[in-house]
């Protein structure tokens, strides 16, 4: 897998261990926690990143548990099971044999059950809504400029094809970025919207996953765009299955 040959590091994932033990002495990088080989020319899957995050020594982890907003990722961090391709397994269980079903971005989509719980398939998250609030500025950003720069960011930094950035909405100070990617649209080699959204989320929090790159410095016509809060909403191709008790809670 491609990695920076000169010093053998993984540009797209700093939570890796790299060594020149690939074919022909090529640099090969493996994700912490899972030991799986990763392709350093593209984003690492969210499942492998979460696993690496959970495997890091507690005292070395400077990362903060995400806020537990309703309708977002209420369960926060957990140590996931990933399949051989680095995707989330449809069923996730903890050490106390409590199990639940997740979608393709690893967010719980059923009530919790026991080991008898069945999750027939990994349901794809095909629509992600990233809701941002930016810090006050002298004036509102120009909507067209903002659209251009956010599209450039997802294209350049996360290598997400522009066709998957469905829309950028703006009503000062709220920015909404809609990512859409159906199973039929995603070709081999395309970055997954869930992975792009996760990298973006970590960048916004100042916890960049990129090796050695500075943090996210986003400007629109030279004006810094500083985000003060983020909410991410996930919509699945098949609606989630929660009991009425949870829905009315």
């Amino acid at each position: 897998h491609t990695a920076a040959q000169d010093n053998c590091t993984c540009p797209t994932n700093k939570m890796t261990v790299c060594s020149p033990d690939g074919p022909g002495g090529r640099c090969q990088c493996r994700a912490l926690g899972s030991g799986m080989a990763v392709d350093c020319s593209t984003l690492t899957s969210k499942c492998l990143l979460l696993k690496a995050r959970m495997s890091a020594p507690k005292n070395a982890r400077t990362l903060v548990r995400p806020s537990e907003h309703a309708l977002v990722d209420n369960d926060g961090l957990y140590d996931p099971d990933c399949d051989p391709e680095g995707r989330f397994k449809a069923r996730q269980c903890n050490q106390t044999s409590v199990c639940w079903c997740v979608n393709s971005v690893g967010v719980r989509r059923t009530d919790k059950g026991d080991l008898s719980l069945r999750c027939d398939e990994l349901v794809r998250t095909h629509h992600i809504l990233i809701d941002l609030r930016h810090r006050p500025t002298a004036g509102a950003f120009n909507h067209s400029d903002l659209d251009a720069e956010l599209r450039r960011l997802f294209r350049e930094r996360y290598r997400l094809h522009p066709k998957f950035v469905a829309a950028v909405h703006y009503e000062q100070p709220t920015i909404q970025i809609e990512l859409r990617q159906n199973t039929s649209q995603k070709a081999a080699g395309d970055v997954d919207i869930g992975d792009a959204a996760y990298y973006f989320e970590r960048d916004i929090k100042g916890e960049s996953l990129f090796q050695g790159r500075g943090g996210l410095d986003l400007r629109v016509r030279g004006e810094p765009l500083q985000v003060e809060r983020t909410l991410i909403y996930y919509l699945d191709e098949i609606p989630p299955k929660f009991s009425m008790k949870r829905l009315t809670a």
Partner: antibody, heavy 117, light 111 residues
Amino acid sequence: QVQLQESGPGLVKPSQTLKLTCTVSGYSISSGYYWNWIRQPPGKGLEWIGYISYSGRNLYNPSLKSRVTISRDTSKNQFSLKLSSVTAADTAVYYCARDTTAYFDYWGQGTLVTVSS
Amino acid sequence: DIQMTQSPSSLSASVGDRVTITCRASESVSSSVNRFLHWYQQKPGKAPKLLIYRASNLESGVPSRFSGSGSGTDFTLTIRSLQPEDFATYYCQQSNEDPYTFGQGTKLEIK
């Protein structure tokens, strides 16, 4: 008023490295925008080479990526192009230009680089 | 890469004429908010000059006889009443996808 000015040798030998510098006045290259190199072979169309951003991020045209490096010197308000292993096909007028929000609003006057032994 | 095709490749016209140049992209270069298609004018021995950005926005200082339209894959540059200084080569450029790509150019000559 933003101004860009290319400088560098007009003649480069085949297999050598082409090196050009763009000096920017009227705007700090680390304050914003994207700072590009574009070329135009004699009598032909325009080809985008790549850019360096205000924060130092690079993006290159995949057709040239293996041979191109764009760097910057913020103390001099300059950005530079290096194109290695040049051939006669790299003979062109090289322009530096500012990319505002994905279009080029300011251009240098261009410098002709001939690759010949 | 997105291919940009301009037509015609060359065009002869007279002062006062209305001229239309078209640019077709191999895939859509529009978003819900933007049309990432821009037009430049280039005179011999000079750098290109931005005329129209995002399909229809006139760059500051550009005469109002120039206008742009279109969306998706098909775009046009119109010069309403040709002036002697308008005889030049015109290029379209897309910035929806990397790498940025230009049309092959349309040379506008005096009839």
